[in-house]
């Protein structure tokens, strides 16, 4: 089948990095500068991606493969193939329509990207709060007060009146 196809279609013999030039009697011509073809038998070469502005070139375009971009420091990639660059925030913040904003009380973000997430509710698992939550860190849950027999642990469980995850900000 391949042999028959190549007899019928001379373009199938054109390797990656070339295109089948109809203007030159279907001979294989190299891709022009700033273009590429990643597969054989192409009738055109694709324009290379340009990494502009906040996009940095991670891998240069070649005649057989597209350029790859990443983001300049202070930004991070979003989407397939780094199709977007999003500004970093600090830990304890999230990016909103009005910029980087501190996490609301009861939520945290331990990364420079993404959204603030609620603290873990230790009491749902029948546990107590071992370490209070902050804007940057989730609470740490410890064993339930009932599990702590005298002398078994040096950790003092929080006062009963305190809500799970409470932390003075």
């Amino acid at each position: 089948f391949e042999r028959t196809r190549s007899l019928q279609d001379p373009c199938s013999n054109c390797p990656a990095g070339t295109f089948c030039d109809n203007n030159r009697n279907q001979i294989c011509s190299p891709c022009p500068p700033n273009s590429f073809s990643s597969a054989g038998g192409q009738r055109t070469c694709d324009i290379c991606r340009q990494c502009k502005g906040v996009f940095r070139t991670r891998k240069e375009c070649s005649s057989t493969s597209n350029a790859e971009c990443d983001c300049t420091p202070g930004f991070h990639c979003l989407g397939a193939g780094c199709s977007m660059c999003e500004q970093d925030c600090k830990q304890g913040q999230e990016l909103t329509k009005k910029g980087c904003k501190d996490c609301c009380f009861g939520t945290f973000n331990d990364q420079k990207r993404g959204i603030c997430r609620p603290w873990t509710n230790c009491s749902l698992d029948g546990k107590s709060v071992l370490v209070n939550g902050t804007k940057e860190r989730d609470v740490v849950c410890g064993p339930s007060p009932a599990d702590l027999s005298p002398g078994a642990s040096s950790v003092t469980p929080p006062a009963p009146a305190r809500e799970p995850g409470h932390s003075p900000q």
Partner: nanobody
Framework: EVQLLESGGGLVQPGGSLRLSCAAS????????MSWARQTPGKGFEWVSG???????YYTESVKDRFTISRDNSKNTVYLQMNSLKPEDTAVYYC????????????????WGQGTQVTVSS
């Protein structure tokens, strides 16, 4: 071909003002959101301000109440009026299309100008 051409940069004393312009061509400017970014050797790129096609404006915290973004669709131009300039505003300022409409986010299909240098120094 899309072109964005910034102008209006220069040397200014602290507390002074500058007005940057960005002349756009090669696309439907009136229906496009536009943005300004800046790049400093120390801090890298920073999203500064954006304006939707309808005129809604957004600013990064550090320039709020000092910078004003505006647009003139009849002239295909977006402006950045910069008042009460500080030495930390020293940077190369870039105009860019803003297809994501999301604060601090640009996409690979956005177009960028060549930039104009702003230096704030006494």
């Amino acid at each position: 071909e899309v072109q964005l051409l910034e102008s209006g940069g220069g040397l200014v004393q602290p507390g002074g003002s500058l007005r940057l312009s960005c002349a756009a061509s090669g696309f439907t400017f009136s229906s496009s959101a536009m943005s300004w970014a800046r790049q400093t050797p120390g801090k890298g790129f920073e999203w500064v301000s954006g304006i939707y096609s309808g005129g809604s404006t957004y600013y990064t915290e550090s320039v709020k109440d000092r910078f004003t973004i505006s647009r003139d669709n009849s002239k295909n131009t977006v402006y950045l009026q910069m008042n009460s300039l500080k030495p930390e505003d020293t940077a190369v300022y870039y105009c860019a299309t803003w297809g994501t409409l999301r604060f601090g986010v640009w996409a690979e299909y956005d177009h960028w100008g060549q930039g104009t240098q702003v230096t704030v120094s006494s």
